[in-house]
């Protein structure tokens, strides 16, 4: 997260760290007791590694009573996700067992009504991704409140040049932005999960390259079918 602040500890009990061989790889969001939603591209290079999900964490390194690392029983990328596009960049991870719920571990309601979030709405994005252009990784969860950007502006030739489909949404990126390592994390608007950080190699913090998020409402049928 660029230009953000350290989050209040455990105030985002849905927040997950998707880990590869014990190190943070991507963000994720607990959407059901045994399921974490993340981004498909996160596991592209994870073929031989051990994928796990950390829940109940604020610090990645410090012991915390609520922290627990779960093995992954099943990884379900969206069937239409492809390495070379940002479209359909969703991944569902089934935990090896149901998460132990409590004040610091709780699923987040996700948007099912397939309608765009109004431009100007302030939404929270959080993650353990890099906090500066030098690539510094934080130990504690960071967050930033960003305004949603209208699709027409985001699709300008100077911005994302038509790449933002109706299944994607954008948020402003003027010095404050999601970045490398935040992919798969939640974009939360008014207590409801609206988007998932896409995992392309976009430049961060440049106002002409807004943050891109996969709209979960557009994938409600797929999410329901996997969770069923």
């Amino acid at each position: 997260i660029l230009g953000g602040r350290e989050a209040e500890a455990h105030a985002r009990p849905y927040m997950a760290s998707v880990q590869l061989n014990g190190a943070h790889l991507c963000g994720g969001v607990l959407v059901a007791e045994q399921w974490v939603l993340s981004a498909a591209h996160c596991l592209e290079d994870a073929a031989d590694g051990k994928v796990q999900v950390l829940l109940g964490a604020h610090s990645l390194s410090q012991p915390e009573p609520s922290k627990r690392l779960y093995d992954v029983l099943r990884a379900v990328p969206h069937p239409d996700s492809q390495p070379d596009t940002i479209d359909h960049d969703l991944l569902l991870l089934q935990l090896s067992e149901k998460a132990t719920l409590g004040p610091a571990v709780r699923p987040l309601p996700w948007q099912r009504v397939d309608r765009d979030v109004a431009p100007g709405t302030l939404c929270d994005v959080a993650g353990w991704g890099i906090v500066n252009h030098a690539g510094r990784r934080p130990d504690s969860l960071q967050h930033v409140l960003l305004p949603v950007l209208d699709r027409a502006t985001c699709n300008r030739r100077t911005h994302h040049d038509g790449a933002i489909t109706e299944r994607l949404m954008c948020a402003e990126s003027n010095r404050r932005d999601s970045c490398k390592g935040d992919s798969g994390g939640p974009l939360v608007c008014g207590g409801v999960l609206e988007g998932v950080v896409t995992s392309g190699s976009r430049v961060c913090g440049n106002r002409k390259k807004p943050g891109i998020y996969t709209r979960v409402a557009s994938y409600a049928a797929w999410i329901d079918s996997v969770l069923a």
């Epitope: 929270d124 409140l145 010095r175 404050r176 008014g190 207590g191 106002r207």
Partner: antibody, heavy 122, light 107 residues
Framework: QVHLQQSGPELVKPGASVKISCKAS????????INWVKQRPGQGLEWIGW????????YYNEKFKGKATLTVDKSSSTAYMLLSSLTSEDSAVYFC???????????????WGQGTSVTVSS | DIQMTQSPASLSVSVGETVTITCRAS??????LAWYQQKQGKSPQLLVY???NLADGVPSRFSGSGSGTQYSLKINSLQSEDFGSYYC?????????FGGGSKLEIK
């Protein structure tokens, strides 16, 4: 102690412009969105728009686009609203208010300035 | 834009009574609602955020409830300092519109 101190009352002529200020203290100015709200005499409240001092990002109610321009001076922790091409419809009390954040993504206007009265009259 | 319909527009109540003010949104606002109190000639003050949470320093006789499109503010055992106008405001999208207000007067 968070405090938003607004500039004093203004009497302006139709067609003119007026710039009102809101000086923030008691918190980190660049970390919180500042809103502006209009209240006509004996009437309700209307949201004009917000500005984020940390990046100068703004968002306006469609109704006030072209009427209000929001700016900040980070060095003095002051937000400004310029109202242009004034008419009698712009006679009102204008408030600045800070967005406070709650939980992960809820917010509300937790601190308000005392209001600036703008009277448009020839 | 989401419309916020507040009722009643005015009410006359005695000290010690209980009052309820309601606010109806034109669509689901997912508890993204605040209540404010405004005294004559003063700025509004935040009472309740996220539909049900009392702001710092607000007396416990105030309470907010509701979900979806229907919300209410309840004031138990009215005190003389509670008289004034009350406004709801949604934060689900933009613009974050206010209700028309409810003026609470002493009977």
């Amino acid at each position: 102690q968070v405090h938003l101190q607004q500039s004093g009352p203004e009497l302006v002529k139709p067609g003119a412009s007026v710039k009102i200020s809101c000086k923030a203290s008691g918190y980190t100015f660049i970390d919180y969105y500042i809103n502006w709200v209009k209240q006509r005499p004996g009437q309700g409240l209307e949201w004009i728009g917000w500005i984020f001092p940390g990046s100068d990002s703004t968002y306006y109610n469609e109704k006030f686009k072209g009427k209000a321009t929001l700016t900040v001076d980070k060095s003095s922790s002051t937000a400004y609203m310029l109202l242009s091409s004034l008419t009698s419809e712009d006679s009102a009390v204008y408030f600045c208010a800070r967005y406070g954040y709650y939980g992960s993504s809820f917010y509300a206007m937790d601190y308000w300035g005392q209001g600036t009265s703008v009277t448009v009259s020839s | 834009d989401i419309q916020m319909t507040q009722s009643p527009a005015s009410l006359s109540v005695s000290v010690g009574e209980t009052v309820t003010i309601t606010c109806r949104a034109s669509e689901n606002i997912y508890s993204n609602l605040a209540w404010y109190q405004q005294k004559q000639g003063k700025s509004p003050q935040l009472l309740v955020y996220a539909a049900t949470n009392l702001a710092d320093g607000v007396p416990s006789r105030f309470s907010g409830s509701g979900s979806g499109t229907q919300y209410s503010l309840k004031i138990n055992s009215l005190q003389s300092e509670d008289f004034g106008s009350y406004y709801c405001q949604h934060f689900w999208g933009t613009p974050p519109t206010f209700g028309g207000g409810s003026k609470l007067e002493i009977k």
